[in-house]
């Protein structure tokens, strides 16, 4: 049994980091191995993590991690059984992939202006919470070319658009992702897509 | 949010012991190490150990080894710092801090007095 | 018995610019994080600036962190007279068991 493809880890930079990895034919990950972590830090104790099966020759971990903070260094052993496959270093904050915003709303109250808003996936005391910017992707469920990226380079988790800036009378949904440029994070995953019906008064022509 | 509330001011003989708690709420206690420093009055701060909630782990200063003990209850989430031998150099404000490299949250400082 | 050094004291007007610097060693500064942390009077000391140059949640960016070498040093802009304070930098040592140690204080005052 050997490591085909070496693990590789991203950190969501709050609780969970996620290692994926290929071994050299079909292997029961959560049987046949391990994936012992250890921070590099006073008194930090070793933590096992039992892999899942990724297609047939892949293997994924979620190591649950505490107070993830940019100094962290975490020792990653790969065993089978009594057999040392594999031994390397992770630094979260290198290798981080945020977590997707959530809840996002579409207000179609405030006269012709729709208003996005989203939640932070963060909480304050995280380093990323004052440092996410978005994507926030809209696009026509009748017309595929009718698809538009926003970038919010601002803190505040919310898009204000002229509702006319769309085309009135049909349905669009709206996702939205977060990176973090202090870091050269990738993006985050969309978060869930929301739906609602545009429409808005033409102005009176004279 | 994060609060570390810490025991009230004491006054000690030299030679007795003290033993200042740290009360923590508003977070995963298990989750975050704990730190003890102590601050003499006009003096800089001096780290003097640290513990780890979820196991009850200690490292201490060498300055410090053999006197000090640090220990947790994970049922009131409180961690504690025993002090024993006391001497007037320990007349100190005694600060527990949450964190690993840094320390985002304190205690407001509990002020140990030895003097006879 | 503080293994970082730091001035005893530095002044400037209000709405100036001050630097602190704290000097260390490669078992200390030149191999780890800097932290640096205020302390007003009659209170606990409240973190400032972390990871060398990064600041918390709540803290103004007047205040920056930086790192050369074995030496660190904390920028305050824009001076307040809310900024009267002593000041610590921290970080590990690791030239025998590791341990966090701090730099022997500044007392910065606003005139």
């Known amino acids: 049994m050997k490591v085909l493809q070496e693990p590789t880890c991203v950190s969501d930079y709050m609780s969970i980091s996620t290692c994926e990895w290929k071994m050299n034919g079909p292997t029961n990950c959560s049987t046949e191995l391990r994936l012992l972590y250890q921070l590099v830090f006073l008194l930090s104790e070793a933590h096992t993590c039992i892999p899942e099966n990724n297609g047939g020759a892949g293997c994924v971990c979620h190591l649950l991690m505490d107070d993830v903070v940019s100094a962290d260094n975490y020792t990653l052993d790969l065993w089978a059984g009594q057999q040392l496959l594999w031994k390397g270093s992770f630094k979260p904050s290198e290798h981080v992939k945020p977590r997707a915003p959530g809840n996002l709303t579409v207000h179609t109250n405030v006269s012709d202006t729709l208003l996005l808003t989203w939640s932070n996936p963060y909480p304050p005391d995280n380093y990323l919470y004052n440092h996410l910017t978005y994507a926030v992707n809209i696009w026509s469920e009748n017309d595929p070319a009718d698809f538009r990226i926003y970038n919010v380079t601002y803190l505040e988790p919310s898009l204000r658009i002229a509702a006319s800036t769309l085309k009135s009378g049909i349905s669009y949904r709206a996702r939205v992702r977060a990176w973090a440029q202090c870091y050269n994070t990738t993006w985050s995953e969309w978060s869930p897509s929301t739906k609602w019906h545009n429409s808005y008064r033409e102005p009176f022509e004279q | 949010q994060v609060q570390l509330v810490q025991s009230g001011a004491e006054v000690k003989k030299p030679g007795a012991s003290v033993k200042v708690s740290c009360k923590a709420s508003?977070?995963?206690?298990?989750?975050?190490?704990m730190h003890w420093a102590r601050q003499a009055p006009g003096q800089g701060l001096e780290w003097m150990g640290i513990?780890?909630?979820?196991?009850?782990?200690?490292s201490y200063a060498q300055k410090f080894q053999g006197r000090v003990t640090m220990t947790r209850d994970t049922s009131t989430s409180t961690v504690y710092m025993e002090l024993s031998s006391l001497r007037s150099e320990d007349t100190a404000v005694y600060y527990c801090?949450?964190?690993?490299?840094?320390?985002?949250?304190w205690g407001k400082g509990t002020l140990v007095t030895v003097s006879s | 018995q503080s293994v970082l050094t730091q001035p005893p004291s530095v002044s400037a007007a209000p709405g100036q610019k001050v630097t602190i610097s704290c000097s260390g060693g490669?078992?200390?500064?030149?191999?780890?994080?800097v932290s640096w942390y205020q302390q007003l009077p009659g209170t606990a000391p409240k973190l400032l600036i972390y990871?060398?140059?990064k600041r918390p949640s709540g803290i103004p960016d007047r205040f920056s962190g930086s790192k050369s070498g074995t030496s660190a040093t904390l920028a305050i802009t824009g001076l307040q007279t809310g900024d009267e304070a002593d000041y610590y930098c921290g970080t590990w040592d690791t030239s025998t068991t590791p341990m966090p140690v701090f730099g022997t204080g500044t007392k910065l005052t606003v005139l």
């Open positions: 990871d060398n140059n």
């Open positions: 513990i780890n909630p979820s196991g009850g782990s200690t």
């Open positions: 508003g977070y995963a206690f298990t989750s975050y190490y």
């Open positions: 801090a949450r964190g690993k490299w840094w320390w985002q949250h």
């Open positions: 490669s078992s200390n500064i030149g191999n780890s994080y």
